[in-house]
Amino acid sequence: SWGVSSPQDVQGVKGSCLLIPCIFSFPADVEVPDGITAIWYYDYSGQRQVVSHSADPKLVEARFRGRTEFMGNPEHRVCNLLLKDLQPEDSGSYNFRFEISEVNRWSDVKGTLVTVTEEPRVPTIASPVELLEGTEVDFNCSTPYVCLQEQVRLQWQGQDPARSVTFNSQKFEPTGVGHLETLHMAMSWQDHGRILRCQLSVANHRAQSEIHLQVKYAPKGVKILLSPSGRNILPGELVTLTCQVNSSYPAVSSIKWLKDGVRLQTKTGVLHLPQAAWSDAGVYTCQAENGVGSLVSPPISLHIFMAEVQVSPAGPILENQTVTLVCNTPNEAPSDLRYSWYKNHVLLEDAHSHTLRLHLATRADTGFYFCEVQNVHGSERSGPVSVVVNHPPLTPVLTAFLETQAGLVGILHCSVVSEPLATLVLSHGGHILASTSGDSDHSPRFSGTSGPNSLRLEIRDLEETDSGEYKCSATNSLGNATSTLDFHANAARLLISPAAEVVEGQAVTLSCRSGLSPTPDARFSWYLNGALLHEGPGSSLLLPAASSTDAGSYHCRARDGHSASGPSSPAVLTVLYPPRQPTFTTRLDLDAAGAGAGRRGLLLCRVDSDPPARLQLLHKDRVVATSLPSGGGCSTCGGCSPRMKVTKAPNLLRVEIHNPLLEEEGLYLCEASNALGNASTSATFNGQATVLAIAPSHTLQEGTEANLTCNVSREAAGSPANFSWFRNGVLWAQGPLETVTLLPVARTDAALYACRILTEAGAQLSTPVLLSVLYPPDR
C-alpha cells in the first residue's frame, strides 16, 4: 500500500537542530526504473515551499538552503529529514512526497507539525507515586528534543552516587521522537527531603526540573531520654521517660512502652512516674510505629536509689543463732554501689558487703540497724530495722538511797537487762515488798512503782527493822537471776546548799540528815577529803565565805546516845575563783641536746584558777601562744615560726623557742583569764641572740691585733644596723660597724666588753667578755 509515516509533531529550540524520522511504502508490484525522488515541503497546503529535493536541490526555498539535510535512503524506504540552525519561523507543517514515475507518486497530507521555540521547555520528570525505603525505583527525565548533530544533554543532579545509576536512551521513530535519562535509585530513609534535579542542555540554553522526594520509612533513632539524669533518682521524685524519635515519615502513629518486657498502659511519647517507687525500677523500652514499620529503642535501666534491710530469721532471735541482714536495692542497681552498715547510728567498721552476718548473736547485737548505699552521685540510707536477741535476765542492778521529802524516805531501785521483759520481785526477810506483776505483802509504808524491766520501792517512816538484806529477782521465759543488797535505814545524807558549785566568797551550808528520828543528844561529825573537819551538835555546818581551800569531798555521820548512822555518800563542793597571779619563768638552755644543738629558750606560765583559765603569751602586743583551743599535747603555733613549739595543759602554757632571734627577746606578758576575772605577769627573756666574739683569742699579747665582733641572730640579717659598745659597763663606742678593731692592743685595753644592736627596741646586751692583755714586766 502507499503511505508515509512520520511523527505527529516534533519540537526544537532556536539555534539547535531537529530530525523528523520518516518511512514510506508503496506496493511491491510498482517498478522503480530510475530511482525515487524524495521531496520535503513546508506548509504543503499553503505556500508549499520546498525544504529538501533529492533530484533538484535548486528547487529548495532560499531560507532552507544549507539548513536541511535529507538523512534518508529512498532505496530503503527511509525519508528522515534534518533541520539545522532552527529559527522560530521554521515552525509549521512538514510533508513528505516521493515520486517513482509520472504515474507512481505519493504525497503525505498528514505531515509533521514542527514547533521551534526561543527557549527549551523544561524536561519532564516521571516518578513512582509512592517511594518506600528499601525499594529500587526509576526516575525518568524526558525531553522531546533530539538533535543528532549536537548533543541534547539530560543530566540528573542531587542523587547519592553510591546508591544510584543513570542510563540514557533516545527514541527516534516515526511514531515519535524523544530523549530519556533514567535515574535508577535504591531508596533510603536518608533520601527523604532530597531535591533531585534534571537539567536539559540544548544549544546554548538550559532548563531544569526538580522533584522533592517524600520517602516513606520506619521510625529511626528511637531512644529513651531519662529525666532526671546524671544523678541518683530518689524515691518519691518525679521521673520522666521520653520516647524520642529522631525521624519518621510518615509521622509516628503509635508509641508502646514496655517495662521488663511487659507492656504498659501509657500510649503517649512521655511516661511519667509521679512518685518514683521501688516497683518502678526496671528495664524500659519504647516502640515507635508508623504505617511503614516500627523500631524498638535500646533498653534503658531505671534504678531508684534506695535500700531496705531484710532480716533473717524473721521470727524471734535466740542467743548463738546466726542473723543475716541483707541490704536490698531495687532492680537495675548499678554495679558500682558501695555498702555501709550502721548500728544505732554508729558506722560498723569493715562491714561493706550488701550482706551483714551476726555470727553467734549475743544480746550486744540487739539494736536498730540500717544500711547505706553509695555511688559517685551520692548516698541513701535504708529505714531502720530492729534486731532483738532474746536472752535470760542478767544480774539485776539493785541500788538503795535515802531521799529527803517530808522526812527521809528509803528508796530501793532494781533494774535488769533481759529479752523478753522479766518479772521483777523485791523482797526483804522473805516478804515480797513489790513486784512488776503487782503482787506484794501490802503495808501502807511501802509503795512500789514499775516500768519495763524496772522496779522502785519507797519506804516511808523508816524504822531500824527496815535495815538488812533486800533481794531482787528477775525471771523471764529463758531463765532468772537475783541480786541482794544491805540497806542501812539509819544512813546519813549530806546536802550542800545553795549549790555544790559556788563562787569564792559565797556562803555555803552543809546539812547532815539521818534516816532515824533526831534526838536531843545527837552529835554530827564532818569530814573533808576523808579527814575529820568538825564535830558538834549541829546538823548543819556553815562556811560563811567559801574559799578555794574549802573545795573538796565532804561526808558526815550522825550519832546519838546508843546508835550511830552509817557514813553519808560523799558530796563534792566546787569553789570557783578567778586566776591568781600567774607564775611566769623564762630561761635559756645552751647546747640543750649536746654539742652543736644551739640555744633553746623556754617560757613557762602556770596559774591557779577554777575553772581553768585561758592563758595567752604576748610579746610586743602580739599573741605568741594561747591555750585555746583546749586539748593537751604540743603543736607549732599557727602563724608562728616553726622554731617555736607550744605545749598546752590546763592552767599551763609552755613555749619552746629553738635558736631565738633578736626580735624574740625582750618583755613577755602572760595573761590568764576565766569567767570570774583575769591576772597577768611579765618576764624578760634573754635569748642570747647577741654574742660578742673576740678574735683571735680572749687573751692577747700587747701590740697584737684584736677584732671584737657583735654577732646578732636576727630576722633582718644583713640589713644595716647601729651598735653600742660597752667597756666595763660604760658606753664606749657607737656606730654602724659590727666589728671593732684594737690595733695595737694596749695593756689598758684589758676590760670587760659587751655590745648591743640599736635597731631593736629592748634588745638585750651580749654576755660580757673579758679581754686579757699579756705584757712583759716593767723595767
Epitope: 521547555r121 523544561v122 542531587g158 536518608q190 527531603g193 531535591i195 537539567q199 538550559r206 532548563a207 522533592h212
Partner: antibody
Framework: QVQLQQPGAELVKPGASVKLSCMAS????????MHWVKQRPGRGLEWIGR????????KYNDNFKNKATLTVDKSSKTSYMQLNSLTSADSAVYFC????????????WGTGTTVTVSS | ENVLTQSPAIMSASPGEKITMTCRAT???????LHWFQQKSGASPKPWIY???NLASGVPARFSGSGSGTSYSLTISSVEAEDAATYYC?????????FGGGTKVEIK
C-alpha cells in the same frame, strides 16, 4: 558582566503592597533560576522562594507562601516579587540571587532593595 | 526544616591569627550543597565558598572550608583586616533552603 540590578529603596504604608524588581544582564536569563532572600536590620538571611524564568515555575518557603508572589518577564529579563499586606515585620532588605545549577550556589547577588513599612 | 547553627556568633582576632568558625545542621547536608557567603556592612552577600570546600572566584587562598554530614567549618589561616565581615553558611540539600545565623569576625 553578569549583574542583577535592584531599586535602592521602597517606602510603603502598612497594609499596602509593593512589587520589587530584579533586572538581569550579562547572561541568558532563562537558563538560571532566581531566588529571593530577606534580611531584617541586624539579622541573618532568610530564603523566601525561587522562580524558573523559563517555565515560571515557583517554590516558596512556607513562611512566605501568603506574603510573597514571584513572577518573571522574559522580554525585559526581569524577575519580580510582590509583597502584600505589609507590616513593620516586612521592613527589610530584599535580595535577588541567581542560582548556579551545578553547585546550587547563589553565585550572583542583586544590590538589594530596602523596604520600609511606615505610616 | 534543617536548622543551621553557627558558632561563635562573634569572634575577635588579631592580624595573622588562625581562626575557625563552625556550622552545625540538625539534619545531614550533602557536602555538594553546603555554601558560605561573606557579607560586609551595608553590602550584598558575596559567594565565598561553595560545595563545602571550593573557593569562589577572587577569594584569597587563606580561606578554606571542610566538613560533612551535620558539621562544617570555615577557616582563615592568617586573618587580615579586610576579612572583617559576617560569614553565613547555607544549605541547599532540602527545602526550605536555610542559612546559619552568621559569625561576625572582628579584627583587633
Amino acid at each position: 558582566q553578569v549583574q542583577l540590578q535592584q531599586p535602592g529603596a521602597e517606602l510603603v504604608k502598612p497594609g499596602a503592597s509593593v512589587k520589587l524588581s530584579c533586572m538581569a544582564s550579562g547572561y541568558i536569563f532563562t537558563n538560571y533560576w532566581m531566588h529571593w532572600v530577606k534580611q531584617r536590620p541586624g539579622r541573618g538571611l532568610e530564603w523566601i522562594g525561587r522562580i524558573d524564568p523559563n517555565s515560571a515555575g515557583t517554590k516558596y518557603n512556607d513562611n512566605f507562601k501568603n506574603k510573597a508572589t514571584l513572577t518573571v518577564d522574559k522580554s525585559s529579563k526581569t524577575s519580580y516579587m510582590q509583597l502584600n499586606s505589609l507590616t513593620s515585620a516586612d521592613s527589610a532588605v530584599y535580595f535577588c540571587a541567581r542560582e548556579d545549577f551545578d553547585s546550587r550556589n547563589f553565585d550572583v547577588w542583586g544590590t538589594g532593595t530596602t523596604v520600609t513599612v511606615s505610616s | 526544616e534543617n536548622v543551621l547553627t553557627q558558632s561563635p556568633a562573634i569572634m575577635s582576632a588579631s592580624p595573622g591569627e588562625k581562626i575557625t568558625m563552625t556550622c552545625r545542621a540538625t539534619s545531614s547536608v550533602s557536602s555538594s550543597y553546603l555554601h558560605w557567603f561573606q557579607q560586609k556592612s551595608g553590602a550584598s552577600p558575596k559567594p565565598w565558598i561553595y560545595s563545602t570546600s571550593n573557593l569562589a572566584s577572587g577569594v584569597p587562598a587563606r580561606f578554606s572550608g571542610s566538613g560533612s554530614g551535620t558539621s562544617y567549618s570555615l577557616t582563615i589561616s592568617s586573618v587580615e583586616a579586610e576579612d572583617a565581615a559576617t560569614y553565613y553558611c547555607q544549605q541547599y540539600s532540602g527545602y526550605p533552603l536555610t542559612f546559619g545565623g552568621g559569625t561576625k569576625v572582628e579584627i583587633k
